[in-house]
């Protein structure tokens, strides 16, 4: 199922089919009898209810408001209302560039490193069933590719691959021919220098715990996009049902690298969890860094120097 239109501000190009899908769609099916209304407001007009009689270009289906096609005068605010649920979008329809196969303001930019995997797939899931054919253009010159339903480029990037790639889907609706264009500006760059991934904090951590309680071991690293962070521990003795790895959390740093953290959760700590190594590793194609955690019973704390302790 096509996801709903959650972006509140949308820019589209005149002359193309376009749709808005509200985000309480599953709810709308449950309450079929509830009144569902679409409204538009722009400049002089306040909240005009939309229906197929408003314009021959507008179609309403369950959760979707369709434009066949969208035109400059469709610019404005749109509202979907159902009971106490309201969703609002601000739609800006821009002029098509008549001298090019794409409109510069509607281009998605992508940076690809040379020799890295480079892929463009022409897909449009919402209009999929109506699409007769799809063409892929590079700098407005048609590329001859085998598949005319979903043309695809899959290769290792070369500098000559740089350019504007436009997927143009041709579709029929009510006897008229329409097209939808999606353009990518592909820039090919030199290999970006990778950092040596590093785990944050001390390499050996003794963690004071109580039997029967839970503990969360947090492992954080600074790494490259393709590097990985994972836990390894004594599973040779069989899987411990009390040990759970949480999903990795990852945020980008201002320098374009990544800060990742992965938590190992140990529930209902038992004797078998004490004095064994729980190893967290960050790995890249260039090497690894590992830090270890050892769970120690609180009563035994006195035996360990204070500087190796984490709480």
């Amino acid at each position: 199922a096509e996801s709903c239109t959650s972006r509140p501000h949308i820019t589209v190009v005149e002359g193309e089919p376009f749709y808005l899908k509200h985000c309480s769609c599953s709810l709308a099916h449950e309450i079929e009898t509830t009144t569902k209304s679409w409204y538009k407001s722009s400049g002089s007009q306040e909240h005009v209810e939309l229906n197929p009689r408003s314009s021959s270009r507008i179609a309403l289906h369950d959760c979707v408001l369709e434009f066949w096609p969208v035109e400059l005068n469709d610019t404005g605010s749109y509202f979907f209302q159902m009971k106490n649920y309201t969703q609002k979008w601000k739609l800006n329809v821009i002029r098509r560039n008549k001298h090019s196969c794409f409109t510069e303001r509607q281009v998605t930019s992508k940076i690809v490193e040379v020799k890295k995997f480079f892929q463009i797939t022409c897909e449009n899931s919402y209009y999929q069933t109506l699409v007769n054919s799809t063409s892929l253009y590079k700098n407005c010159k048609k590329l001859l590719l085998e598949n005319n339903k979903n043309p695809t480029i899959k290769k290792n990037a070369e500098f000559e691959d740089q350019g504007y790639y436009s997927c143009v889907h041709f579709l029929h609706h009510n006897g008229k021919l329409f097209n939808i264009t999606k353009t990518f500006n592909i820039t090919i760059v030199e290999d970006r220098s990778n950092i040596v991934p590093v785990l944050l904090g001390p390499k050996l951590n003794h963690v004071a715990v109580e039997l029967g309680k839970n503990v969360r071991l947090n492992c954080s690293a600074l790494l490259n996009e393709e590097d990985v962070i994972y836990w390894m521990f004594g599973e040779e003795n069989g899987s411990d049902p009390n040990i759970h790895e949480e999903k990795e959390m990852r945020i980008m740093t201002p320098e374009g690298k990544w800060h990742a953290s992965k938590v190992l959760r140990i529930e209902n700590i038992g004797e078998s969890n004490l004095n064994v190594l729980y190893n967290c590793t960050v790995a890249s194609t260039g090497g690894t860094d590992t830090k270890s955690f050892i769970l120690v019973r609180k009563a035994d704390m006195a035996d360990i120097p204070g500087h190796v302790f984490t709480r």
Epitope: D227, V228, Y230, M232, E235, E236, T281, A283, S284, T285, G286, G287, T288
Partner: nanobody, 115 residues
Framework: DVPLQESGGGLVQPGQSLRLSCAAS????????MGWFQQAPGKGRDLIAR???????YYTDSVKGRFTISKDNAKNTLYLQMNSLNLEDTGVYYC?????????WGQGTQVTVSS
């Protein structure tokens, strides 16, 4: 020559199965701990299953009881049998070695679970 080549992905409905393969050229996998990683859209690569040189296996909670990792040392190939697939299993799947520097990544294989 790509050192790791994943294959076997596809579009399936919830509850269905897939078997992924990872053919390793170059270094033999028999001496390495090998793992399968899942990369959901916009996320990092999460290790979901691994197998030691001796054949001991480990799975994360999200796949335990549904996925099975195995390897064929003679064919230098790692496998992931995925049963009872659900929507959260959607992503690109990669294999790689653990416990040392990673091999160069393959292109991965896309698994899409959709109703």
């Amino acid at each position: 020559d790509v050192p790791l080549q994943e294959s076997g992905g596809g579009l399936v409905q919830p509850g269905q199965s897939l078997r992924l393969s990872c053919a390793a050229s170059g270094s033999p996998i028999r001496f390495s701990v090998m793992g399968w990683f899942q990369q959901a859209p916009g996320k990092g690569r999460d290790l979901i299953a691994r197998i030691t040189s001796g054949g001991i296996v480990y799975y994360t909670d999200s796949v335990k009881g549904r996925f099975t990792i195995s390897k064929d040392n003679a064919k230098n190939t790692l496998y992931l049998q995925m049963n009872s697939l659900n929507l959260e299993d959607t992503g690109v799947y990669y294999c790689n070695r653990l416990g040392g520097a990673l091999f160069d990544w393959g292109q991965g294989t896309q698994v899409t679970v959709s109703s």
